[in-house]
Interface confidence: low
């Protein structure tokens, strides 16, 4: 016997969907209706039958009621080939919901998102996660994309994209936007950061993480950041190979005074990289390649320490107190 | 060996106030997120607030607006004022805390307190 595709929790609180059958009974996905996370995995299938089943430019009015009643807080929707118009009938309808943390992975989108017909109201999402999404419309897709949400995004992540670099003049700012997660994107490089970052659209970030970018330096990110107008509250470069030393022929970077909390974790260095910011409250350098403990001078004016995982602190070593390096 | 010790929790009245107080001790090196969890019988434990060592908070939707918390690095304390008490707000709230310390070796991991109840009855 084949499992059931869908598995509701106890609590009613989170759904997960596993449909790998070719021909999948979409139907039970309804005994998700009562739960606040839900999972759909679609198992790689392609969608575009689905066009053929549904309106997709029905007036999403016609279910307002329905939708709204549902408690989905949570979605996720991964492993399908998904037509545009598709998935934006999705999001018209899901414009009435009380949707605010929506997860897209393993997504391959068909087709060009038609423009937001001037009735329709956009998805009041405070997060968009997006994994191995790719798009048609290459480095347009987010500024597609954006349209159909309500100008109050707070969360944006986006990991293995095939178009990490977006069209910056068609994209429009995110005012609310405090944490932009670019991690897992390996080929970015700090020139495709610059392009990533597109100049003034990202007025409010706080927290910028940059996980496994192919960062080289800090300095060579403070430049790209500097160029953009981001100055993020905490900046997290864990996992980038970051080489210690600066270019002498490279101009020196200002860090913006609101950077407070660094994170160098993993990042293979054997000695504190040179062009750190002045002062900071958090350096995180744990798990890296240090031989020695840092002396003072090599070390920004900091308050939390972290140093745990590095060579030189084998056992009987002390571990620095945070501010005791000042 | 790491605790963490909470306090201010007790008996209040709807719309009125408790500040809640939750301090680490131990061998103590780093302290990095804390934050306010809060259970209520046979429910899961919930988010209520968290603060990183920088200050930015996170709060659940339900407590936006009546609840702030903050922390004192130097004391490795975290706080939750709670205004606008009401019934829904009654629970066993829990203190949670990431921290770098020192027993045999250098260590990082969460630690939760044991909870002081909060009851919201007229």
């Known amino acids: 016997t084949t499992p059931e595709p869908c598995e509701l929790d106890d609590e009613d609180f989170r759904c997960v969907c596993n449909f790998s059958e070719p021909q999948p009974d979409w139907s039970e996905a309804f005994q998700c209706v009562s739960a606040v996370e839900v999972e759909i995995h679609a198992g790689g299938l392609n969608l575009e039958p689905f066009l053929k089943r549904v309106d997709a430019d029905a007036d999403p009015r016609q279910y307002a009621d329905t939708v709204k009643a549902l408690r989905v807080r949570r979605l996720t929707v991964g492993a399908a080939q998904v037509p545009a118009q598709l998935l934006v009938g999705a999001l018209r309808v899901l414009a009435y919901s009380r949707l605010k943390e929506l997860t897209l992975e393993d997504l391959k989108i068909t087709g060009t998102m038609p423009p937001l017909p001037l009735e329709a109201t956009g998805l009041a999402l405070s997060s968009l996660r997006l994994r191995n999404v790719s798009w048609a419309t290459g480095r347009s897709w987010l500024a597609e994309l954006q349209q159909w949400l309500k100008p109050g995004l707070k969360v944006l992540s986006i990991a293995q994209a095939h178009s990490p670099a977006f069209s910056c003049e068609q994209v429009r700012a995110f005012p609310a936007l405090t944490s932009l997660d670019l991690s897992d994107n390996p080929g970015l490089g700090e020139r495709g950061l610059m392009a990533a970052l597109c100049p003034h659209k990202f007025p409010a970030i706080q927290n910028l993480a940059l996980r496994n970018t192919g960062m080289e330096t800090p300095t060579g990110v403070c430049a790209a950041l500097a160029a953009a107008g981001v100055q993020p509250h905490s900046l997290d470069l864990s996992h980038n190979s970051l080489r210690a030393t600066v270019n002498p022929s490279a101009p020196r970077c200002m860090w913006s005074s609101a950077l407070n909390s660094l994170n160098l974790s993993f990042a293979g260095l054997e000695q504190v990289p040179k062009g750190l910011p002045a002062k900071l409250r958090v350096l995180d350098l744990s798990c890296n390649r240090l031989n020695r403990a840092p002396q003072p001078d090599e070390l920004p004016e900091v308050d939390n320490l972290t140093l745990d995982g590095n060579p030189f602190l084998v056992p009987g070593t002390a571990l620095p107190h945070e501010g005791s390096m000042n | 060996q790491v605790q963490l010790q909470e306090s201010g929790g007790g008996l209040v009245q709807p719309g009125g106030s408790l500040r809640l107080s939750c301090v680490a001790s131990?061998?103590?090196?780093?302290?990095?997120?804390m934050g306010w969890y809060r259970q209520t019988l046979g429910d899961q434990r919930e988010m209520v607030a968290t603060i990183d060592y920088g200050g930015v908070a996170r709060y659940a939707d339900a407590v936006k607006g009546r609840f702030t918390i903050s922390r004192d690095n130097a004391k490795s304390a975290v706080y939750l004022q709670m205004n606008s008490l009401n019934r829904e707000d009654t629970a066993v709230y829990y203190c949670?805390?990431?921290?770098?310390?020192?027993?045999?070796?250098?260590?990082?991991?969460?630690?939760w307190g044991q909870g002081t109840q909060v009851t919201v009855s007229s």
């Open positions: 949670n805390a990431d921290i770098l310390y020192k027993s045999d070796s250098y260590a990082r991991r969460e630690f």
């Open positions: 131990g061998n103590i090196r780093s302290v990095g997120d």
